[in-house]
Structures are given as C-alpha cells and as structure tokens.
Interface confidence: medium
C-alpha cells in the first residue's frame, strides 16, 4: 500500500533542496533563499537559522541543510546545536550564578567552560600521586609505591583525561 501510494504521490519525487509546490500543480520548486529542505518529498522548506548577536556562523545554510552556529569570541556554546552562548571563564574556574568562581580545593577545570571536577583519586587504582593537582590541572598518578622498589621498571605516568574542547575561537 505504501509503495502504491508513493508511486501516486508526485511529491515523493521532489528531492532535498526542493519543495512540492501545491500552487504550481505539485511541481518540485527550489527552496527560496534562506530556506532549506533536508529530505525529499517536503511540502515546505524550513527557514534557515540565523547566527546573530552572540552567535556566529560555523556552517552556512544551503538548500539542503540548515546553518550551524557557534559563539563569537569570549563566549562558548551551551545546549544542543549551540542553542545558547555563555561567557568564558578562566581555566581553574566554573561559572556560577554569581559569575566565575575559582575551583574549590581538590577540584580542577582545564577549560574555559564547564564545571570543576574532582582530582583523580590515585589510590583507588593502587597508584600514588606523581604530580599534585591544581585548580587548572588534574593530579598525575604514578606507579604504586610497591612498583618503585629497586629493579622495578619505570612507568610513564598517563596523561590526565581531557574533555573535548569547546568551539574554536
């Protein structure tokens, strides 16, 4: 039934980047400027997102895909699809309702966005602290004290885990 219906529906032939124009006998018309259709068979084109104010254009709108925004310098994205922009803080800080605040002792933030996270607890993995943590950097865990006995092979400490960086400025 679905297959029969699609064969009878002239709109199903309209590709992405066009819409099925009811005002013109269901002819496939190109999307007007500043609009797009990302799938075929659409009866209207969607208005392109405009990256204005604190937003800037990361990817231009095309006839088949919406524009994508990130944030102007000094701001970073929040929310799905960069729905909001928020001012950067310094590394070693997190944004609170009262502005940017330094990370509490025992926590760190190595980015200009996001929240302060606890230092890694090296002892949970049976390791010792090789490099102390700071507000900006996690601790570096080294080999456990037992591994440091004479003749034990040296171990390269793992780099601290990093979250993906925010949108490029």
């Amino acid at each position: 039934f679905e297959r029969t219906r699609s064969l009878q529906d002239p709109c199903s032939n309209c590709p992405a980047g066009t819409f099925c124009d009811n005002n013109r006998n269901q002819i496939c018309s190109p999307c007007p400027p500043n609009s797009f259709s990302s799938a075929g068979g659409q009866r209207t084109c969607d208005i392109c997102r405009q990256c204005k104010g604190v937003f800037r254009t990361r990817k231009e709108c095309s006839s088949t895909s919406n524009a994508e925004c990130d944030c102007t310098p000094g701001f970073h994205c929040l929310g799905a699809g960069c729905s909001m922009c928020e001012q950067d803080c310094k590394q070693g800080q997190e944004l609170t309702k009262k502005g940017c605040k330094d990370c509490c002792f025992g926590t760190f933030n190595d980015q200009k966005r996001g929240i302060c996270r606890p230092w890694t607890n090296c002892s949970l993995d049976g390791k010792s602290v090789l490099v102390n943590g700071t507000k900006e950097r996690d601790v570096v865990c080294g080999p456990s004290p037992a591994d440091l006995s004479p003749g034990a092979s040296s171990v390269t400490p793992p780099a601290p885990a990093r979250e993906p960086g925010h949108s490029p400025q």
């Epitope: 405009q50 990256c51 204005k52 104010g53 604190v54 800037r56 254009t57 102007t72 310098p73 000094g74 701001f75 001012q87 950067d88 803080c89 310094k90 590394q91 800080q93 944004l95 009262k98 502005g99 940017c100 200009k112 400025q169």
Partner: antibody, heavy 118, light 107 residues
Framework: QVQLQESGPGLVKPSETLSITCTVS????????VHWVRQPPGKGLEWLGV???????DYNPSLKSRVTISKDTSKNQVSFKLSSLTAADTAIYYC????????????WGQGTLVTVSS | DIQMTQSPSSLSASVGDRVTVTCRAS??????VAWYQQKPGKAPKALIY???YRDSGVPSRFSGSGSGTDFTLTISSVQPEDFATYYC?????????FGGGTKLEIK
C-alpha cells in the same frame, strides 16, 4: 546609569610602562567584560584586548607581549598596562563595556590621552 | 587578521539627505559587524550590532544591512547631530578589527 572612567598619567617616557585604570559604575565586572581600544590623534580605532567577566583575557597579537589587563572586581576597577613604550603608542586610550549580546562595545569611557615623549 | 575597508573615507551631505557608508571585510564574517559613531573630542557610541540590530536609544533613521563580506550603514534622512565619523567593526574572530572610518561632513 552605566559609566566608565579612565585615569592615566598623561605623559610617559619612551621605554617605560603605561598604566591606566578604568573605574566602572552602574554594572558589575562579575557579569560583563571590558575592552581596551586606542586611537592615535587624528586616526582610527585599534582594539587592544579584553578581560572577560571570569577574568580570562584576550589580547591583540600585534601587542600581546606588551599588554596586561587585570581587574579588581571589589573595587570596580580594570587595569591596563602597556610596556616598552614608543612614540607610536601616543593615543587616546578607551575602556568600553562588552554587553551580553555580542562581542562588541556598548558603553565607552571618555578616554584618556597618553603622550609618549622624553 | 580580518581587514575592514570602509568607503568613502569622507563624504559631504546636507540635512535631509540619504547617506550610505559601506564596509568590506577581507573574509566572511557572517553578520558579526557593528557600527559606531564618533563626534570630535568624544568617545565612540554604539549604533548597530549583528549588522542590522539598532542599539537601544539609536534613532530609527540609522539602519544597517549586509552579511558575509559587504555591509552598509544607511542614514535615511541626515540630521544636524549626525555629522560625525562612523566606524565599522568585525567581531567574528580575534583580533577584533575596525574600519578606517568615514567622516560625514556638512555640504
């Protein structure tokens, strides 16, 4: 109402360090960034740098090694320092607030003229 | 750095004239352009941001348009207080850069 006021030395000698303070009122430095812009006599505007609400700074690469911007939120003051001065640094220096809507300057101080001369 | 080239560098107009100032960016800056007005001996004043949004308190005779690389500031009917120098500024990327200015003089 929103106000920014620069205070500077007026005259500085070559090779010295310029220090200007911008005192703000009508808004909080916890929420707003502050830019520094200069204008040589009879010429156009040049962006020098910005300090954001959280204290992070961004500088114009052409001056980066010579510029330092800091702030004292409790005193409502932003400090601008420019080292290794030459006659080419003679200009009016402005501080200006960054709104929450874009990386622009919505309110400006009246500016302070700095002359670099021996 | 993104260069912002303004034209003309100066123009003469009479009260009531329609005036247009243009600004061209050396690369695509989307709509991340602001316009400022500066009178002699005074600090610049924000007029427009995001290429077309008037700042609060700016008279409706000022309008901005454009996107990408070409931008326009239009004064629909010049008033005596509009004679000043106008600057465009891009804020798409660091360093923030200004145009060289356009001086609007009385004819």
């Amino acid at each position: 109402q929103v106000q920014l006021q620069e205070s500077g030395p007026g005259l500085v000698k070559p090779s010295e360090t310029l220090s200007i303070t911008c005192t703000v009122s009508g808004f909080s430095l916890i929420s707003y960034g502050v830019h520094w812009v200069r204008q040589p006599p009879g010429k156009g505007l040049e962006w020098l740098g910005v300090i954001w609400s959280g204290g992070s700074t961004d500088y114009n690469p052409s001056l980066k090694s010579r510029v330092t911007i800091s702030k004292d939120t409790s005193k409502n003051q932003v400090s601008f320092k420019l080292s290794s001065l030459t006659a080419a640094d003679t200009a009016i220096y402005y501080c200006a607030r960054n709104p929450l809507t874009a990386t622009v300057m919505d309110y400006w101080g009246q500016g302070t003229l700095v002359t670099v001369s021996s | 750095d993104i260069q912002m080239t303004q034209s003309p560098s100066s123009l003469s107009a009479s009260v009531g004239d329609r005036v247009t100032v243009t600004c061209r960016a050396s690369q695509n800056v989307g709509t991340n352009v602001a316009w400022y007005q500066q009178k002699p001996g005074k600090a610049p004043k924000a007029l427009i941001y995001s290429a077309s949004y008037r700042d609060s308190g700016v008279p409706s005779r000022f309008s901005g348009s454009g996107s990408g690389t070409d931008f326009t500031l239009t004064i629909s009917s010049v008033q005596p207080e509009d004679f000043a120098t106008y600057y465009c500024q891009q804020y798409n990327s660091y360093p923030l850069t200004f145009g060289g200015g356009t001086k609007l003089e009385i004819k």
